[in-house]
Interface confidence: medium
């Protein structure tokens, strides 16, 4: 299947880079600067050459809230985060590629500054290609760098 | 630690019914889809098909279409196998193997069945 | 379905031999995420299988470095770097990229 994504025509400015409200973190790690929209993260995704890392979760999911507390207290994670840019979503976008199978919280996903969805990037559960429990964060910081690792694209 | 136990051997008559189950512990049993395998004696390895334990919903191979059916009782973290109008030809061993996104990793124990007039 | 060609079917060793097991499968295993679903399981008699690789060469938790997986397409490879005596049995190749899961019909590791 196709998983390239089109970003939006949103335009951002250039270079600007102000610490972010702390509300945009939604505790998922308050040092860290996060994007607010969709199309926001796509575009400083390809143009800071750097991947994008989308968590999609929910406030009044338990098992959001399970992951977020490992995801903020854990100091590799936090500290690898800085390298990617990073969204949190608690609505669904309307890019069908985000949720290859199934719209379920939590799920952390990976975009290529190419604008290609990593979906060969996958967490251990077969129902739940994209979803992480607490104990994953092994894994999930072994997904980080291979998302790091950014595909190569032909000029 | 992480553990498939199966219910014990079961003989039967041809045209009864068998109900096999699978208890899992050691994991959070929603995550993660549980796999049906046939052996029968001195063969190799035949999947079934699987059950996704988050939504209920059974997948079948051709072959175990019809007189097989996958289920769950999910708050005892258990699932089940059931064979209806058994032949002669379904005694093998029964195996449920957890699914992960990369293979099937814990497999249950095997559960005998022997088809016999 | 794709067919899973195991060789040989009886692989005679002595303990501390290098042993090799081929497994090919009928059409590629290149999953359209990129993933090769290639997994080798051993099964000792009257037990069940037991994961030692998945995806061609990363072993499962506890399974032993003398055990080896290494492949791509469709030509897979198993290698036991010295055989012992616990590592005698009957050594599956199996494949999940393609619906339905298919596995080889089983290599037997047996002392010469």
């Known amino acids: 299947r196709d998983t390239t994504v089109k970003p939006g025509a949103k335009k951002d400015t250039k270079d600007s880079r102000p610490k972010l409200p702390q509300t945009l973190s939604r505790g998922w790690g308050d040092q860290l600067i996060w994007t607010q929209t969709y199309e926001e993260a796509l575009y400083k995704s390809k143009t800071s050459n750097k991947p994008l890392m989308i968590i999609h979760h929910l406030d009044e999911c338990p098992h959001s809230q399970a992951l977020k507390k490992v995801f903020a207290e854990n100091k590799e994670i936090q500290k690898l985060a800085e390298q990617f840019v990073l969204l949190n979503l608690v609505y669904e976008t309307t890019d069908k590629h985000l949720s290859p199978d199934g719209q379920y919280v939590p799920r952390i996903m990976f975009v290529d500054p190419s604008l290609t969805v990593r979906a060969d990037i996958t967490g251990r559960y077969s129902n739940r290609l994209y979803a992480y429990e607490p104990a994953d964060t092994a894994l999930l910081l072994d997904n980080m760098k291979k998302a790091l690792k950014l595909l190569k694209t032909e000029l | 630690q992480i553990q498939l136990v199966q219910s014990g051997p079961e003989l039967k008559k041809p045209g009864e019914t068998v109900k096999i189950s699978c208890k899992a512990s050691?994991?959070?049993?929603?995550?993660?889809?549980m796999n049906w395998v046939k052996q029968a004696p001195g063969k190799g390895l035949k999947w079934m098909g699987w059950i996704n334990t988050d939504t209920g919903k059974p997948t079948y191979t051709e072959e175990f279409k019809g007189r097989f059916a996958f289920s769950l009782a999910t708050s005892a973290s258990t699932a089940y196998l059931q064979i209806n109008n058994l032949r002669n030809e379904d005694t093998a061993t029964y195996f449920c193997g957890r699914v992960t996104a990369d293979s099937m990793d814990y497999w249950g124990q095997g559960t005998s069945v022997t088809v016999s007039s | 379905d794709v067919v899973m060609t195991q060789t040989p079917l009886s692989l005679p060793v002595s303990l501390g031999d290098q042993a090799s097991i081929s497994c090919r499968s009928s059409?590629?295993?290149?999953?359209?995420?990129?993933?090769?679903?290639l997994h080798w399981f051993l099964q000792k008699p009257g037990q069940s299988p037991k994961l030692l690789i998945y995806?061609?060469?990363n072993r499962f938790s506890g399974v032993p470095d003398r055990f080896s997986g290494s492949g791509s397409g469709t030509d897979f490879t198993l290698k036991i770097s010295r055989v012992e005596a616990e590592d005698l049995g009957v050594y599956f190749c199996?494949?999940?990229?393609?619906?339905?899961?298919?596995f080889g019909a089983g290599t037997k590791l047996e002392l010469k």
């Open positions: 050691g994991y959070t049993f929603t995550n993660y889809g």
């Open positions: 199996s494949q999940s990229t393609h619906v339905p899961l298919t």
């Open positions: 995806k061609v060469s």
């Open positions: 059409q590629s295993l290149v999953h359209s995420n990129g993933n090769i679903y």
